[in-house]
Interface confidence: low
């Protein structure tokens, strides 16, 4: 360049380049001025005159120093699921980002092209990972001892309250309902547990660690801002066991006495013998055994089976598909066995309760007067449906009832045929909604 400052337009030296904020005009073969952001070249330079710039019109912009004949058009207005985070000005384009409760499913260089609503985890499922600006919420089934009764993109699984006396056992989508005395929140031993109080969030992507009640497994479980509760259902298991035992013994005696009386009157009894058991569940069956679908035959002891599930919870949790199922935006994941498990839930209000497990077999002999030869039908009725045991995640085809509602004492006018006919098993559905196949 010449020693003195060259004013545009000027001819560059051979092999030289134009200065900053200048461009080389091929037609004029001169170095000419660029136009600043917010302007465009209205008239290009000549050998004798420099570039004439003009302001961009409404809804157009230039963001850089330029020599474009026309300003760029601003992008279209933000859609209803978007928020305009940067307005269209003469110097910058409009930028649209997803509004709260939505995430960017398809981004572009600046802002978002397509927003999708953040997935809402339905009851029985809690948020496992929060949504971000570019990723959706991930839901996970509520582990045993926890529940979520909301459809939310922020709520986590919270622990069941501990009851001194359980009115209704909790499951994955419902808290336990207590009778009278004030409840406390559950706390499993052996793990660093994080509390899960009722969530009242205003932010749309409020992450909260989701619980997993396998002892020693999840360190995000119930303790919390308030001091941990000392209460546990474990301390009422023994009395419940006694009640169950006494009741069973009473029924047995009545049945035996009844049969003895019938025998004494030289009438051959027709005995309908049935067994109802308060099951001592193997570890891999425990989870399916609980929930609102459970038909409690011994209604006087609603909490009789709610305890000693700690080990089974941990064993079963190993199969819980918490967060790896692919999910379409806005759709719930079909998690098969995992979801079935969450839906049947757990009525274990106290994962830490170490009570006495009671295994009661109640044999009820219902005898009716009949001249026909003695007939007895024996039926075990408390087989457990295990929705969680198949490793493939496929729900079992057969639907095994949790238990039968027994109509034990029947009119003596009933014939043997009608009596026997009434023993036909009618499988009750497991009450597991949407138990689709788990994606492999």
């Amino acid at each position: 360049l010449p020693a003195q400052v060259a004013f545009t337009p000027y001819a560059p030296e051979p092999g030289g380049t134009c200065r900053l904020r200048e461009y080389y005009d091929q037609t004029a073969q001169m170095c000419c001025s660029k136009c600043p952001p917010g302007q465009h070249a209205k008239v290009f330079c000549t050998k004798t005159s420099d570039t004439v710039c003009d302001s961009c019109e409404d809804s157009t912009y230039t963001q850089l120093w330029n020599w474009v004949p026309e300003c760029l058009s601003c992008g279209s207005r933000c859609s209803s699921d978007q928020v305009e985070t940067q307005a269209c000005t003469r110097e910058q384009n409009r930028i649209c980002t997803c509004r709260p409760g939505w995430y960017c499913a398809l981004s572009k260089q600046e802002g978002c092209r397509l927003c999708a609503q953040l997935r809402k985890c339905r009851p029985g499922f809690g948020v496992a990972r929060p949504g971000t600006e570019t990723s959706d919420v991930v839901c996970k089934p509520c582990a045993p001892g926890t529940f979520s009764n909301t459809t939310s993109s922020t709520d986590i699984c919270r622990p069941h309250q501990i009851c001194h006396v359980v009115a209704i056992p909790g499951n994955a989508s419902m808290d336990a309902v207590c009778t009278s005395t004030s409840p406390t929140r559950s706390m499993a031993p052996g793990a660093v547990h994080l509390p899960q109080p009722v969530s009242t969030r205003s932010q749309h992507t409020q992450p909260t660690p989701a619980p997993s009640t396998a002892p020693g497994t999840s360190f995000l479980l119930p303790v919390g801002p308030s001091p941990p509760a000392e209460g546990s259902t474990g301390d009422i298991v023994l009395p419940v066991g006694l009640i169950v035992g006494v009741t069973a013994l009473g029924l047995l005696i009545i049945g035996v006495v009844n049969c003895v009386i019938m025998t004494q009157v030289k009438k051959k009894p027709l005995c309908l013998q049935r067994e109802t058991k308060v099951p001592h569940l193997p570890a891999d069956k425990a989870r399916g055994a609980q929930g609102p679908e459970q038909q409690h035959l011994l209604t006087t002891v609603p909490s009789s089976s709610s305890s000693s599930l700690e080990s089974s919870a941990s064993a079963l949790d190993r199969r819980a598909p918490t967060r790896n199922q692919p999910q379409a935006p806005g759709a719930e994941k079909a998690s098969g066995a995992g979801e079935a498990r969450a839906s049947t839930g757990s009525s274990d209000s106290s994962p830490g309760g170490h009570g006495t497990q009671v295994n009661v077999t109640c044999i009820v002999n219902v005898c009716s007067s009949s001249d026909h030869s003695s007939q007895c039908s024996s039926q075990a009725s408390s087989t457990m449906g295990d929705t969680d045991a198949s490793p493939s995640g496929s729900p079992k085809d057969e639907q095994v009832p949790f238990s039968k509602e027994e109509c034990a004492f029947r009119s003596q006018l009933e014939t043997p045929e009608t009596l026997l006919g009434s023993t036909e098993e009618k499988p009750l559905p497991l009450g597991v909604p949407d138990a689709g196949m788990k994606p492999s």
Epitope: P130, S135, H204, A210, F219
Partner: antibody, heavy 117, light 112 residues
């Protein structure tokens, strides 16, 4: 007992490679997102990378993108961090951490990676 | 430079109440929860507070967390000598692909 145990750290020259491993025990490894978090000597914690439960999604700190690769083998309950083109600024204690909804509730004891000529 | 800002140091005498702040923006703390970690000298970090204000079991109730807007704070009441450690806040950042961000850490010294 829930435990994470890192290994594979050591002294390496700039431009060299190392592979860190993290053996998990006491919990269902395949149910959790896992992360690597590092801490340079006398400095604070810095998240490096994380991976989802089945390994299909991986995220990285910008400064390690293209050089580090996080992976997992659920059958072996092991998390890995393959570190290539190492730089002096990668010198740190590398912790393997279990992520439960964004909170790192279980941490390994850490393994020291020193990048020096 | 950390995404979340913490004071480099804080101090207090035994029995005192100390507060450590953590400042962020609308893309992280403003729209996500905050977790706090305690790192005792020579050990791995330990989760202290999660989801803004919840304590894992085993963490004394002397530790409490809170969040307001784009900042969060950790309060330690009834300070003890064993509380001397580094404290880190952590959150998500909706604008970052990896989304996990830490504060620079605060060294807490218990005097006397």
């Amino acid at each position: 007992e829930v435990q994470l145990l890192e290994s594979g750290g050591g002294l390496v020259q700039p431009g060299g490679s190392l592979r860190l491993s993290c053996a998990a025990s006491g919990f269902t490894f395949s149910d959790y997102y896992m992360s690597w978090v590092r801490q340079a000597p006398g400095k604070g914690l810095e998240w490096v990378a994380n991976i989802n439960t089945d390994g299909s999604e991986k995220y990285y700190l910008d400064s390690v993108k293209g050089r580090f690769t996080i992976s997992r083998d659920n059958s072996k309950n092991t998390l890995y961090l393959q570190m290539n083109s190492l730089r002096a600024e990668d010198t740190a204690v590398y912790y393997c951490a279990r992520e439960e909804y964004g909170a790192f509730d279980i941490w390994g004891q850490g393994t020291l990676v020193t990048v020096s000529s | 430079q950390s995404v979340l800002t913490q004071p480099p140091s804080a101090s207090g005498t035994p029995g005192q109440r100390v507060t450590i702040s953590c400042s962020g923006s609308s893309s992280n703390i403003g729209s996500n929860t905050v977790n706090w970690y305690q790192q005792l000298p020579g050990t791995a970090p330990k989760l202290l507070i999660y989801d803004n204000n919840k304590r894992p079991s085993g963490v004394p109730d002397r530790f409490s967390g809170s969040k307001s807007g784009t900042s969060a704070s950790l309060a330690i009441s009834g300070l003890r000598s064993e509380d001397e450690a580094d404290y880190y806040c952590q959150s998500f950042d909706r604008g970052l692909s990896g989304s996990i961000v830490f504060g620079g850490g605060t060294k807490l010294t218990v005097l006397g």
